[in-house]
């Protein structure tokens, strides 16, 4: 019996087609992805093949103005239109709290939404009961397939699930659910989830009875043969893991942002054992036409977005200096504003010993593309912020050793004075440079804000200590020459859309007046 698994993950509100780098589509003839194009391909495969499942491994939420405005209603609407068969909860599905998941998505989805390792307690338990499931048995042709879900247990540090959801260890939670399915004579089981490629592989290895793992969170690109675009494969598709009980378990993921549609064909024997598996992600490029009816629906929904981008978010009573002349040479108040917003967006009081789990932010000055003048009645709009942060990036959470941070700050000024983008703006950090010293030895003082303290204060950076830092995904990926961050980071979790972070902060503060306050000094 043959099953075709079509899968997406980490779509991050890319409902419209995008450029090759998943930013805003500029030249339509070269654009990719989007739900209208995805629907064309899915329908083509459904017509050609008998047993097809369309699955999503989480993080539909967060990433463009679509999510900012529609808050998840767009996800439910278009996933329903594409007739997804199941979805796993990702960490970003909790970005607007549990209510922001229940109302727009859980109550509206016409497909099961899954996670076996999230347990509700207290008053939430009855409110959310049955709205998401640990597993769902689906009819596929004349057979049945069990889909069991899982979600990153780091979600409380990455999003806003509140205090009434407990995120258990994935493997511990999955095994009894898979055992239950086996007891119920369901012999073809897919683990669908959002914990990253390393955990996907562990699940394939450790959870007895799982036949296939469809993952997300780490934006992993797998491919067999010559890759069709810029993404470099982390391994073959499918990636085969030998389980502890000796089975060959295919593990797949389909990069991110709806650029590819994962396509995996599995052959099962009559006892539900995987005989063979093969496939590849399908690049959703312009050779695949956008479905006209879905496209028309997108255009209808788009109207509200255009109206939103010119509405006032808040006011500034000071000039927001985002000029290259400032932000690439010294502390600039636009950099301070953005870093303060980044920290504020990551406030998670999950431990009595810590006032917060993260206190530091770094931001490449070259990523700040425009100032905002306060003399326009102080008004700040989404449109203004899109000029400051035009690249559609995310502000991510990483863990780095102090020694890596020190290298990053040396890199920040290694060729100071040439208006280059690597000059770092900061939050929760006090740095002093001596430019008379040779490159690589110019950081004379580097103090960081404590987290394990009741009264936050600045202490010298310790080289061997591990620190959490919020930074743009551009830097986490080694951009602007920050190769040491990419090479030495100990953990990397994708965060929220950059403009969304700053806009939310401005809306919350209502009136802002960021200052230049001595975060960066020269001796």
């Amino acid at each position: 019996w043959e099953l075709t698994i079509l899968h997406t993950n980490d779509v991050h509100s890319r409902l419209e087609q995008t450029s090759e780098d998943s930013s805003k589509c500029v030249n339509a003839s070269r654009c990719m992805g989007g739900v209208a194009r995805l629907f064309t391909k899915v329908q083509q495969i459904r017509r050609a093949e008998p047993n097809v499942l369309l699955l999503d491994a989480g993080d539909q939420y967060q990433g463009t103005i679509w999510f900012t405005v529609y808050k998840g209603a767009e996800v439910a609407h278009f996933m329903n239109a594409l007739r997804y068969d199941a979805m796993a909860l990702g960490n970003h599905e909790f970005d607007n709290g549990v209510e922001g998941l229940i109302e727009p998505l859980l109550k509206e989805a016409k497909f099961p939404i899954l996670s076996a390792n999230i347990k509700a307690k207290g008053p939430l338990a009855s409110q959310i009961s049955g709205l998401y499931l640990p597993y769902k048995v689906l009819p596929v042709g004349d057979e049945v397939v069990g889909i069991v879900g899982y979600t990153s247990k780091e979600t409380p540090f990455l999003s806003n699930p509140g205090t009434n959801l407990v995120f258990e260890d994935e493997i511990t939670a999955l095994q009894p659910e898979v055992d239950k399915l086996k007891t119920l004579n369901v012999n073809k089981i897919i683990a669908l989830g959002h914990s990253g490629f390393e955990m996907d592989k562990l699940i394939a290895q450790k959870v007895r009875g799982v036949d296939v793992v469809v993952g997300g969170h780490s934006n992993t690109f797998l491919y067999t043969g010559n890759p069709p675009s810029k993404e470099v494969p982390a391994g073959k598709y499918p990636f085969i893991v030998t389980s502890d009980d000796g089975r060959k378990v295919p593990v797949v993921q389909a990069y991110a942002f709806g650029k590819y549609l994962g396509y995996l064909k599995i052959e099962f024997d009559e006892r539900g054992n995987v005989i063979s598996s093969h496939g590849n992600p399908i690049l959703l490029n312009s050779s695949i036409p956008e479905d006209p009816s879905i496209k028309a629906d997108i255009n209808k929904w788009r109207i509200k977005l255009d109206n939103y981008s010119t509405q006032e978010l808040g006011k500034t009573i000071v000039y927001l200096d985002g000029s290259s002349q400032s932000c690439r040479f010294r502390e600039c108040n636009m950099g301070n504003l953005i870093c303060d917003a980044m920290i504020n967006n990551n406030l998670r009081h999950t431990d009595e010993m810590f006032w917060n789990h993260v206190s530091m932010c770094i931001l490449n000055g070259g990523g700040i593309r425009s100032p905002i003048d306060e003399r326009n009645n102080g008004t700040i709009t989404w449109e203004n912020l899109a000029a400051v942060l035009p690249f559609g990036g995310t502000f991510d959470l990483v863990q780095l050793k102090g020694s890596t941070l020190k290298k990053a700050f040396e890199h920040s000024v290694h060729r100071y004075g040439q208006s280059t983008g690597e000059f770092l703006q900061v939050g929760g950090i006090h740095v002093v440079y001596d430019l008379s010293r040779k490159p690589g030895d110019r950081v004379v003082k580097l103090d960081v804000l404590c987290t394990k303290c009741r009264v936050p204060s600045y202490d010298p950076l310790k080289m061997d200590e591990v620190y959490k830092v919020i930074l743009p995904n551009f830097l986490a990926n080694g951009g602007d020459g920050f190769q040491m961050i990419k090479d030495e980071l100990l953990r990397h979790d994708s965060g929220d859309q950059d403009i969304n972070v700053v806009s939310t902060y401005i809306s919350k503060m209502k009136v802002i007046y960021p200052a230049v306050e001595g975060r960066i000094k020269f001796s």
């Epitope: 016409k110 499931l133 769902k136 239950k180 399915l181």
Partner: nanobody, 128 residues
């Protein structure tokens, strides 16, 4: 081989009663949410009543509330639908369906999600 077999259908006069049975072979109904659905000629299939395996919670469509009763006998691996005060508009093919997923009885009956196991159906005709 897993099977759901419905029985008890037939011709009945308006105001009369029938009891439908759904017998399962190949799986234990204790662990399943069970539903009765019906499809009248030219109409969509609709959920009539559902019952859970765990806490025996039930759900009824508004159109049958107070007239129909769902019950289960786990020792016989059978679910019943007692139908009373039957009307002409109750005429339909009645199907039994089962889902081992932990869905609510309401989600099962709507049905919110695809249901994996179905019987072949039994015809109920209400006519004088």
């Amino acid at each position: 081989q897993r099977q759901l077999v419905e029985s008890g259908g037939g011709l009945v006069q308006p105001g009369g009663s029938l009891r439908l049975s759904c017998a399962a072979s190949g799986f234990l109904l204790d662990y399943y949410v069970i539903g009765w659905f019906r499809q009248a000629p030219g109409k969509e299939r609709e959920g009539v009543s559902c019952i859970s395996g765990s806490d025996r919670s039930t759900y009824y469509a508004d159109s049958v509330k107070g007239r129909f009763t769902i019950s289960r006998d786990n020792s016989k691996n059978t679910v019943y639908l007692q139908m009373g005060s039957l009307r002409a508009e109750d005429t339909a093919v009645y199907y039994c369906a089962a889902d081992p997923s932990p869905v609510t009885v309401q989600a099962m009956c709507l049905p919110r999600f695809p249901v994996p196991y179905w019987g072949q159906g039994t015809l109920v005709t209400v006519s004088s």
